[in-house]
């Protein structure tokens, strides 16, 4: 599976985990059909993927949620892919927004985010949502990952 | 296009094909602007992409569909990316769900799925939907592919 | 960041730019947290990514838009990923469609497109939408990129 000792494959795919925390940062787990190629990428505190090597990474997240227009705030459901680099401000890399459904009790929708970004050693990426209680954690619905180019 | 004889590029992108079959598994074809890098990945029976080499793959699917809330079941439209490995359970890798539109005669919506997964030699991936008759087969709307890292 | 002098990494990620032009082709900029790996991929005229080397590329786009059913045409909002190759017809590679929301003044929705395609030297890819005035240009909402396998 190695490209060579100096250039091992680096990839991760983690699975959403329901959380009692009120934080807007989604929680993830190495469970089910997950991927964690080696220790050059790690899942930290169940909330962020952290890389040890600088380079270009394709980073993606998929979030499925169930919401209703009447029961939700006016604002849409927003999922954000964010970056934390040592000694720098946190940044938004990608965002997606979906207006709440009129279906009752709630209408399911899925969001997919993905892009190529340069990460520094020790950089972490995480996923924020406007309302984590609306996120669907059924098999395959919500996941998060990356691969090093 | 080779990374080297021992490590050729492996990638595929296939195009949706309307089918008279009542199966929930979508049908695909090597037509239009498709990709099939070599015989290390093949489209089998028009329904699954099968790989010959073990490794990490980024697998994706896009499904556009047109549905109406009144004419459809209560359940949302669900697209599933699934895995078949020799001697193992079939597995759901990824799913996305979208509630039906209230637009008439139907409202179009697009779903995108993608993630990194380890595949065994002989493993196949395929796409399931709740109602294949709702899928849009116009140019570029529905496609399926993978690339080996 | 090099795979070797003969095989450098090629990747780009550009950020949407509001435009006063009435063209349906989206405009992009190298701003914010953008990626432009080297001069083997370039952003031309703020509208297309052009590659110098033949090969397989994973190309993606994300478009967030805000529309209302009553204020829009009957037709859905469609985003298209298109290809221009020297001496050939332009082609649609990928499309996604979303019916307009009934939310007022408008309802936000996000579309993600992505797939693997063979590009010729000098080939350009660009993104078309049915109504560019509906596109959301807030941080992270709309972006476009590629990576060479």
């Amino acid at each position: 599976m190695q490209k060579g000792d100096q250039n091992p494959q680096i990839a991760a795919h983690v699975i959403s985990e329901a959380s009692s925390k009120t934080t807007s940062v989604l929680q993830w787990a190495e469970k089910g059909y997950y991927t964690m190629s080696n220790n050059l990428v790690t899942l930290e505190n169940g909330k962020q993927l952290t890389v040890k090597r600088q380079g270009l990474y394709y980073i993606y997240a998929q979030v499925t949620f169930c919401s209703n227009r009447e029961a939700s705030s006016q604002a849409p459901f927003i999922a954000s892919l964010c970056l934390k680099s040592p000694g720098r401000f946190e940044r938004i890399l990608l965002r997606a927004a979906n207006t709440h459904s009129s279906a009752k009790p709630c209408g399911q929708q899925s969001i997919h985010l993905g892009g190529v970004f340069e990460l520094q050693p020790g950089a972490s990426v995480f996923v924020n949502v406007t309302d984590p209680s609306q996120v669907s954690h059924g098999t395959g619905f919500t996941s998060f990952g990356l691969l090093k180019l | 296009m080779q990374k080297g004889d021992q490590n050729p590029q492996i990638a595929a992108h296939v195009i949706s094909e309307a089918s008279s079959k009542t199966t929930s598994v979508l049908q695909w074809a090597e037509k239009g602007y498709y990709t099939m890098s070599n015989n290390l990945v093949t489209l089998e029976n028009g329904k699954q992409l099968t790989v010959k080499r073990q490794g990490l793959y980024y697998i994706y699917a896009q499904v556009t569909f047109c549905s109406n809330r009144e004419a459809s079941s209560q359940a949302p439209f669900i697209a599933s990316l699934c895995l078949k490995s020799p001697g193992r359970f079939e597995r759901i890798l990824l799913r996305a769900a979208n509630t039906h539109s209230s637009a008439k005669p139907c409202g179009q919506q697009s779903i995108h799925l993608g993630g990194v997964f380890e595949l065994q030699p002989g493993a196949s991936v395929f796409v399931n939907v709740t109602d294949p008759s709702q899928v849009s087969h116009g140019t570029g709307f529905t496609s399926f592919g993978l690339l080996k890292l | 960041m090099q795979k070797g002098d003969q095989n450098p990494q090629i990747a780009a990620h550009v950020i949407s730019e509001a435009s006063s032009k009435t063209t349906s082709v989206l405009q992009w900029a190298e701003k914010g947290y953008y990626t432009m790996s080297n001069n083997l991929v370039t952003l031309e005229n703020g509208k297309q990514l052009t590659v110098k080397r033949q090969g397989l590329y994973y190309i993606y786009a994300q478009v967030t838009f805000c529309s209302n059913r009553e204020a829009s045409s009957q037709a859905p909002f469609i985003a298209s990923l298109c290809l221009k190759s020297p001496g050939r017809f332009e082609r649609i590679l990928l499309r996604a469609a979303n019916t307009h929301s009934s939310a007022k003044p408008c309802g936000q929705q996000s579309i993600h497109l992505g797939g693997v395609f063979e590009l010729q030297p000098g080939a350009s890819v660009f993104v078309n939408v049915t109504d560019p005035s509906q596109v959301s240009h807030g941080t992270g909402f709309t972006s476009f990129g590629l990576l060479k396998l």
Epitope: E30, K31, G32, Y33, Y34, T35, M36, H137, G138, T139, G140 | R88, F89, R91, I92, R95, E118, Q120 | -
Partner: nanobody, 123 residues
């Protein structure tokens, strides 16, 4: 390790129905995937159906789709396979299996197997 005990096999006429049960013990039922394989005489073991006990998501082999239904009762730690419109080609030993994960790659999942129950479809 998960212990699995199947029941419900037997002889049935073509077009008839049977319901197989698989009782599991050994760890929390909702932490693994349950399903069925079958092996006909002289053939390889093949996948039939699977259910994710955490949320009820399921998949079926093409050959049984629309005829067989897999379900699970988490309170009883039991999975079921309802088989309708049975055909002679459904004749096989049916094995219940549970898939669990250790640490490391998700490919390193392990299967625990029941002893098998014979289903014969014949007139």
């Amino acid at each position: 390790e998960v212990q699995l005990v199947e029941s419900g096999g037997g002889l049935v006429q073509p077009g008839g129905s049977l319901r197989l049960s698989c009782a599991a013990s050994g760890r929390s039922f909702s932490t693994y995937t349950m399903g069925w394989f079958r092996q006909a005489p002289g053939k390889e073991r093949e996948f039939v159906a699977v259910i994710y006990t955490s949320d009820g998501a399921n998949l079926y082999a093409d050959s049984v789709k629309g005829r067989f239904t897999i379900s699970a009762d988490n309170s009883k730690n039991t999975a079921y396979l309802q088989m309708n419109s049975l055909k002679p080609e459904d004749t096989a030993v049916y094995y219940c299996a549970a898939e669990t994960y250790g640490s490391g790659s998700s490919l390193m999942s392990e299967y625990d197997w029941g002893q098998g129950t014979l289903v014969t479809v014949s007139s």
